[in-house]
């Protein structure tokens, strides 16, 4: 992909970013008593930037080398590297910084595809797993719950580790871990269902390490519009991986004649990707893209980080909005195929299903729509935000809010259309999901703007935790519970099976509207919280060690 090949060049705002980074370097040069010469902002041949820390030269290949500092009392003051043109300057390698970072982003995105491919391969062969192990629906629910709960619990732990230790090592270990567990789980004997449950829990832990840390590395490789673009690519991996997971699950099962083989594909790819991450992803410093180099040290405790995040209103509101998205996608993903099947039974275009899988065709269509709308949503959201940033500083949360509120309308229309037209319902699903998914990458970008680099992994983890806890961990069960409750008070008929589930699912658009409100609330505080984060970053770049953040 061209956009990955040379990301910094492809992004429309690349020149603007360069100028912005240049201004920041000059400003810091002045702050650090460089005599106002701006030597810290000096650029070497081919445009190698000297980091704000003054002790590193970032080469075009993305590598970092120690820069010579002049002896005390010389013009090359401590904390300000010699200019690239001056004596003693090291000439950077003539390779492309954009290409190195682009490759890193590509590998990280590939890893995210695999994360979701692995997760949804299991979903793709879930009926076979249920059949083989004799798993009841409550057992299948347990598999899902254990995965989400372990993911939720592990996310904050990896957030803490990700802000303090080598991130690419944690990432690779996480991938190697879930790959090994998934591969092993394909050999679990029929009588050890509890081992399968445990393996899903362990996979959840392994995948939490990735989902929590990878976006923060992208955040440290890029800024502004390029970062939005790269996060869009990264988050497009979710619908792509999910769709590929279903496809892999069913096609490998058919090709091999045994569902066990489906669980052996993603681990092999995972091992390769884990190795590529170790080799190709640079060990970036936190705040690297913000030209902060070595200066950002995690001096704060986890408790202080948590307090700061909870006080960050943009972060809190955007996290609650993310939970609303998660609630809706979790519930719709589980129940819409069955709802549409029941709609067809009412319309007399399908038979009542007594032997599952019920609505297998609808699941397939819904899966394909989700995959495509995921892509369309991410692209639309990123494009809209980019355009709106020219008009307002609050573009990010406002685009999300509009997407959410628009999505709620079309989700409501699904239940109106389904009574008479399945095609109409699918069109509403298509538009509704596109709008709902448009905020994926933008939400991640909001987080990058309002949270300082040394807290980003913790912030991503906490957001992941809350969005699962308040979102998809409970929504499928809540919808099922409400549907059963309605059915208990009505007569047993295909019409009421359809209506009760429809009424229960009507909770989703209300939650999505609530999410839109949370994004509007984010818009209120976004500018001030972003400015505060930038101010804190600038403070962190100054010499005094005891900067309170």
């Amino acid at each position: 992909m061209m956009c990955l090949e040379c990301a910094s060049a492809a992004a429309g705002g690349a020149e603007e970013e360069e100028a912005d980074a240049e201004r920041r370097r000059r400003r810091r040069g002045a702050q650090r008593g460089a005599g106002g010469s701006g030597c810290c902002g000096a650029r070497g041949a081919g445009g190698a930037g000297v980091s704000a820390a003054g002790d590193e030269v970032q080469t075009l290949s993305g590598s970092v080398r120690r820069a010579p500092t002049g002896p005390p009392g010389t013009p090359g003051t401590p904390g300000c590297a010699a200019t690239a043109k001056g004596p003693g300057a090291q000439q950077p390698k003539p390779a492309s910084l954009g290409r190195g970072r682009g490759a890193a982003a590509a590998i990280l995105s590939l890893g995210n595809v695999l994360n979701y491919l692995d997760r949804y391969t299991v979903a793709g062969v879930l009926l076979d797993i249920q059949q083989h192990f004799g798993v009841k629906d409550r057992g299948a629910g347990l598999l899902q719950s254990v995965f989400i709960c372990s993911f939720m619990v592990a996310a904050p732990i990896f957030g803490y580790l990700g802000d303090r230790f080598n991130r690419k090592v944690i990432l690779s270990c996480g991938i190697f871990f879930w790959s090994a567990v998934t591969f092993s789980s394909s050999f679990i004997p029929q009588q050890y269902f509890w081992l399968l449950v445990a393996s899903r829990g362990l996979v959840g832990i392994g995948e939490a390490s990735y989902s929590t840390i990878a976006p923060t590395i992208i955040g440290d490789l890029f800024t502004k519009n390029t970062r939005t673009l790269m996060l869009s690519v990264f988050y497009f991996a979710i619908p792509l991986g999910s769709g590929l997971g279903y496809i892999t699950g069913s096609s490998v099962k058919q090709a091999a004649g045994d569902w066990h083989w489906a669980l052996r594909v993603s681990p092999v790819l995972g091992m390769i990707t884990g190795t590529l991450i170790l080799i190709l992803v640079p060990a970036t410093k936190r705040g690297h893209a913000d030209q902060l180099g070595d200066q950002l040290k995690a001096r704060t405790s986890w408790l202080r980080d948590m307090k700061a995040l909870i006080r960050n209103r943009s972060y809190v509101f955007s996290s609650l909005a993310t939970s609303a998205v998660s609630f809706a996608t979790g519930a719709l993903g589980m129940w819409i195929p069955l709802y549409l099947h029941r709609a067809q039974v009412v319309q007399k275009t399908a038979e009542t299903c007594n032997s599952p899988p019920c609505g297998a065709k609808d699941s397939l269509i819904f899966g394909a729509i989700t995959c495509f709308t995921g892509f369309l949503g991410v692209v639309t959201g990123a494009g809209a935000t980019r355009w709106c940033r020219l008009k307002t500083q609050r573009a990010d949360p406002l685009v999300c809010a509009v997407g959410m509120l628009g999505s709620a309308i079309f989700i409501c229309l699904i239940f109106v259309a389904a009574k008479s037209s399945i095609v109409g319902a699918y069109i509403c699903i298509f538009v509704g999901e596109t709008l709902l998914f448009s905020n994926w990458a933008i939400t991640a970008d909001i987080l990058m703007y309002v949270v300082i680099p040394t807290r980003r992994a913790t912030a991503v983890a906490l957001q992941s935790f809350t969005s699962h806890l308040l979102g998809d961990a409970g929504s499928p069960y809540l919808i099922g519970f409400i549907s059963d409750l309605i059915r208990q008070s009505t007569k047993d008929s295909p019409l009421w099976e359809f209506l009760s589930l429809g009424y229960a699912l009507m909770l989703c658009p209300f939650v999505v509207v609530l999410g839109g409100m949370f994004f509007l609330a984010t818009a209120l505080f976004f500018v001030s919280d972003r400015a505060r984060a930038e101010q804190q970053v600038n403070q962190l770049a100054m010499p005094p060690a005891s900067v309170k953040v």
């Epitope: 629906d137 004997p189 009588q191 269902f193």
Partner: antibody, heavy 125, light 107 residues
């Protein structure tokens, strides 16, 4: 004590129908998978049909030899499982056993931990 | 469908002897094999589940082993009540299938 008692057997003509019933007691029937297994005179055992519990949508599975002719069903309120046999053939002559699958709440074993005493079905003209 | 083959079809032993009954699957089935005993004019009863797991109330002289395609039911010191037909059953995949049985008779 777990008990499975089959009824409804007898002599019928080819092409006719018969409904076997299995009354159960001593365990939580609504959570348990049930099967019918048959044994032709002097022959081995053959699994016929399986019905899962309501937590598995009461899904039914059948042996290829009887698919489309036999229907397994259950009535949780009466703790009974049934086998409706239509278009009976000579080769359906056998002792039909009602069997229970061992239950583990979240999942179930496919083996049979309890068997009824069996009921004889003879298909002959 | 998975086909199970039991050998020998008939096995003649004297009480007190130890015997091994074999069951072979047409494809690898891990440990998803179960053994049943059917005495004359009685219903079958479960002896061993998942190749080697013992069942409550079944004498300890019955044991099972094997994995993949080859399985063994061992009876240590056969007693008079053990002379019956023994069936293996696979639960690796539907349809559930039984072996043709091995008849254990008095020599």
């Amino acid at each position: 004590e777990v008990q499975l008692v089959e009824t409804g057997g007898g002599l019928v003509r080819p092409g006719s129908s018969l409904k076997l019933s299995c009354a159960t007691s001593g365990f939580t029937f609504s959570d348990t998978w049930m099967s019918w297994v048959r044994q032709a005179p002097g022959k081995g055992l053959e699994w016929v049909a399986l019905i899962k519990d309501k937590n598995s949508n009461s899904e039914a599975n059948y042996a290829e030899s009887i698919k489309g002719r036999f229907t397994i069903s259950r009535d949780d309120s009466k703790s009974r499982v049934y086998l409706q046999m239509n278009t009976l053939r000579d080769q359906d002559t056998a002792t039909y056993y009602c069997t229970r699958h061992e239950d583990f709440y979240y999942y179930s074993g496919y083996y049979f931990d309890y068997w009824g005493q069996g009921v004889m079905v003879t298909v002959s003209s | 469908d998975i086909v199970l083959t039991q050998s020998p079809p008939t096995l003649s032993v004297t009480p007190g002897e130890s015997v091994s009954l074999s069951c072979r699957a047409s494809q690898g089935i891990s440990t998803s094999i179960h053994w049943y005993q059917q005495r004359s004019n009685e219903s079958p009863r479960l002896l061993i589940k998942y190749a080697s797991q013992s069942i409550a109330g079944i004498p300890s002289r019955f044991s099972g082993s094997g994995s993949g395609t080859d399985f063994i039911l061992s009876i240590n010191r056969v007693e008079s009540e053990d002379f019956s037909v023994y069936y293996c059953q696979q639960t690796y995949s539907l349809p559930l299938t039984f072996g043709p049985g091995t008849k254990l008779e008095v020599k």
